[in-house]
């Protein structure tokens, strides 16, 4: 297939990736699906530099990222290894808190108002960030 060499309209390029920042809120699963339909994924933070870039663009607003533990282990949506990768949790987080009374614990990660991460109820309607890598094979079939 062809390769994407520049970011789509309304996406922001940074370090060979493209980012799209929502201005509305969705539950984590709906945000995840939105990104997939854009041939992208919820943002995967792999470095302090990328953390600062995303933080700068989202401001002090709760925002979903592509990290969850809905099936046990913490997993990044693109398969990046959680155990050995970059982490930026708030102190005492993640805590899988049950005190919210909504049922279950907290299985989805988001940026908090200071940029550090928290786990929260996946149904909460937070903003989200999509990411796609430049130079990766396009999802479109090649022209015949």
């Amino acid at each position: 297939g062809s390769e994407r060499t520049c970011c789509p309209v309304n996406w922001v390029e940074h370090e060979r990736s493209c980012y799209w920042f929502s201005r509305s809120g969705k539950a984590w699963a709906d945000a995840d699906n939105y990104c997939r339909l854009e041939d992208a994924h919820l943002v995967v933070v792999t470095s302090w530099e990328e953390q600062k870039f995303v933080q700068h663009h989202i401001g002090p607003v709760n925002t979903w990222m592509g990290l969850h533990d809905q099936n046990g282990p913490w997993k990044w949506v693109d398969g990046t290894d959680y155990e050995t990768g970059f982490k930026n949790w708030r102190p005492e987080q993640p805590d899988d808190w049950y005190g919210h009374g909504l049922g279950g614990g907290e299985d989805c990660a988001h940026f908090t108002d200071d940029g550090r991460w928290n786990d929260d109820v996946c149904q909460r309607p937070y903003r989200w960030v999509c990411e796609t890598e430049l130079d990766k094979a396009s999802q479109e079939p090649p022209l015949l």
Epitope: Q70, Q93, D95, D96, Y98, G103, G104
Partner: antibody, heavy 112, light 107 residues
Framework: EVQLLESGGGLVQPGGSLRLSCAAS????????MTWVRQAPGKGLEWVST????????YYADSVRGRFAISRDSSKNTLYLQMNSLRAEDTAVYYC?????WGQGTLVTVSS | DIQMTQSPSSLSASVGDRVTITCRAS??????LAWFQQKPGKAPKSLIY???SLQSGVPSKFRGSGSGTDFTLTISNLQPEDFASYYC?????????FGPGTKVDIK
């Protein structure tokens, strides 16, 4: 590979104390809530206690509240269960568990 | 507290059979339900999380379904290694509670 290894079980008299340990490896220990579950001989599974990843929240079954204390030491990747005022009905295999993985269990026998 | 019931308490089946185990919660637990398999003298093994999500490494012959109060675990093409006890557990709210178990043995 995720591994959980319990230790500290044994024979204790009613009213006595034991501390169980669970050594964890193969995962980022402080990122996960951890749980103790027990199984009396020939019986089903009973949830005992859960502690959040950083230890800020603890939860207990009514049957052990006030007698058992769950804790964790992230520097040692170890989960603990301090069991006081033990009763005959606490006799069971005690399992340390993460959502998707269980240890092999350690047997606690309370008998005079 | 949320009570969990399972049926049947035991069942006999043959190799190759398809068996279904039912789990019922005393109140709505959404999809906060897990299934575990336990063989004699061994620790439980996690099969299903979130009512229908297969744990990594678990064969697709195990299928979980349901939401709210009624859940099922279906095991297709039963093999000798599948003869064991099966437990459901709710993790909607504390105290977490297990069903009493279903023992699947060879007919």
């Amino acid at each position: 590979e995720v591994q959980l290894l319990e230790s500290g079980g044994g024979l204790v008299q009613p009213g006595g104390s034991l501390r169980l340990s669970c050594a964890a490896s193969g995962f980022s220990f402080s990122s996960y809530a951890m749980t103790w579950v027990r199984q009396a001989p020939g019986k089903g599974l009973e949830w005992v206690s859960t502690i959040s990843g950083r230890g800020g929240h603890t939860y207990y079954a009514d049957s052990v509240r006030g007698r058992f204390a769950i804790s964790r030491d992230s520097s040692k990747n170890t989960l603990y269960l301090q069991m006081n005022s033990l009763r005959a009905e606490d006799t069971a295999v005690y399992y340390c568990a993460k959502q998707d993985c269980w240890g092999q269990g350690t047997l606690v026998t309370v008998s005079s | 507290d949320i009570q969990m019931t399972q049926s049947p308490s035991s069942l006999s089946a043959s190799v190759g059979d398809r068996v279904t185990i039912t789990c019922r919660a005393s109140q709505d637990i959404s999809n906060y339900l897990a299934w575990f398999q336990q063989k004699p003298g061994k620790a439980p093994k996690s099969l299903i999380y979130a009512a229908s999500s297969l744990q990594s490494g678990v064969p697709s012959k195990f299928r979980g379904s349901g939401s709210g109060t009624d859940f099922t675990l279906t095991i297709s093409n039963l093999q000798p290694e599948d003869f064991a006890s099966y437990y459901c557990q709710q993790y909607h709210s504390f105290p977490f509670t297990f069903g009493p178990g279903t023992k699947v043995d060879i007919k």
